[in-house]
């Protein structure tokens, strides 16, 4: 059959989740193809525990999740429900705010280097997780 | 060995349709994203549609979306292009491609020796 | 779409001799930049990913530099099966991956 029993390797097992961090940056909409093309998704958080599963794993480094809100209220790509899940924004965040300079707003939500949630501009060179839940990843994974 | 073979090509009349295959062999093709390029008479290389190893995600270039479907056969290590409504602009040597990954970086790794598919009346 | 320019669009040179070829990306790709070698009627053949990784199996006169915008593959010294096509690809965005137009290498 087409499930698996065990993550890709360089995928990191947790919760019958597989994760994979990215080491490089891309925009927002460029990871989210990315981890597509992987068949997975931008990590979506779900709690607290997975919080602080992905903020060990990716140090304090500024990091994109798999949350937006580009066509006006806030979704997870999975289509996890936002409104009634799990959230860990930075005080006064999201804020949407516009005096980057880059024009428009701020429509994607990223981890901070203390792990707090805060939106930013989409265009952020960000390092990026991708997730697949365990019966979806791949046997053998692309490798060089 | 790891190999790419593409069948499928040849002349259409515009408005017409085509279907390429790419048979795939040496490797786990589940594993992998693929893709098509395609290169006109005499121009660069130019990327036209992927797909993911499980095939839930696919992608195309403006220039063939709403036209051209990219799928895929992982029981059968075949890659599939069905063009329609082709067009003169579509004339080209269609190549398909594996899509490698690393460390977040991707690359085309592994191309079959092209198909020539020709739009002409 | 980041376009991908590269100069020159061909050039004469003899074996042994140095040659350099530059791409560059209409916006920063940081180091997603490919490389790939092509022969008339074959197809392409990659040499180099992420900036300067050398494919396995490529000589290793073939060398990648660059970052954000601007790239340069050289070969260190030609040789006769080098006379060729090279195309940069960047895979900053990806998909859709775009290619340069192309430089080909010519005996002078």
């Known amino acids: 059959g087409s499930e698996r029993t065990c993550c890709p390797v360089n995928w990191v097992e947790h919760e019958r989740s597989c994760y994979w961090f990215s080491r490089s940056g891309k925009a927002w909409a460029d990871a989210d193809n990315y981890c597509r093309l992987e068949d997975a998704h931008l990590v979506v958080v779900t709690s607290w525990e997975e919080q602080k599963f992905v903020q060990h794993h990716i140090g304090p480094v500024n990091t994109w999740m798999g949350l937006h809100d580009q066509n006006g209220p806030w979704k997870w790509v999975d289509g996890t429900d936002y409104e009634t899940g799990f959230k860990n924004w930075r005080p006064e965040q999201p804020d949407d705010w516009y005096g980057h300079g880059l024009g428009g707003g701020e429509d994607c939500a990223h981890f901070t280097d203390d792990g707090r949630w805060n939106d930013d501009v989409c265009q952020r060179p960000y390092r990026w997780v991708c997730e697949t839940e365990l019966d979806k990843a791949s046997q053998e994974p692309p490798l060089l | 060995e790891v190999q790419l073979l593409e069948s499928g090509g040849g002349l259409v009349q515009p408005g017409g349709s085509l279907r390429l295959s790419c048979a795939a062999s040496?490797?786990?093709?589940?594993?992998?994203?693929m893709s098509w390029v395609r290169q006109a008479p005499g121009k660069g290389l130019e990327w036209v549609s992927a797909?993911?190893?499980?095939?839930?995600?696919?992608f195309y270039a403006d220039s063939v979306r709403g036209r051209f479907t990219i799928s895929r056969d992982n029981s059968k290590n075949t890659l599939y292009l069905q063009m329609n409504s082709l067009r003169a602009e579509d004339t080209a040597v269609y190549y398909c491609a594996r899509r490698i990954a690393v460390d977040g970086y991707d690359a085309f790794d592994v191309w079959g020796q092209g198909t020539m598919v020709t739009v002409s009346s | 779409d980041i376009q991908m320019t590269q100069s020159p669009s061909s050039l004469s040179a003899s074996v042994g001799d140095r040659v350099t070829i530059t791409c560059r990306a209409s916006?920063?790709?940081?180091?997603?930049l490919n490389w790939f070698q092509q022969k008339p009627g074959k197809a392409p053949k990659l040499l180099i990913y992420?900036?300067?990784s050398l494919q396995s199996g490529v000589p290793s006169r073939f060398s990648g530099s660059g970052s954000g915008t601007d790239f340069t593959l050289t070969i260190s010294s030609l040789q006769p099966e080098d006379f060729a096509t090279y195309s940069c690809?960047?895979?900053?965005?990806?998909?859709?991956?775009?290619f340069g137009q192309g430089t080909k290498v010519e005996f002078k």
């Open positions: 916006q920063s790709i940081s180091s997603y």
């Open positions: 690809q960047q895979s900053y965005s990806s998909p859709p991956w775009t």
């Open positions: 992420a900036e300067s």
């Open positions: 797909i993911s190893g499980r095939g839930g995600n696919t």
């Open positions: 040496g490797f786990t093709f589940s594993s992998y994203a």
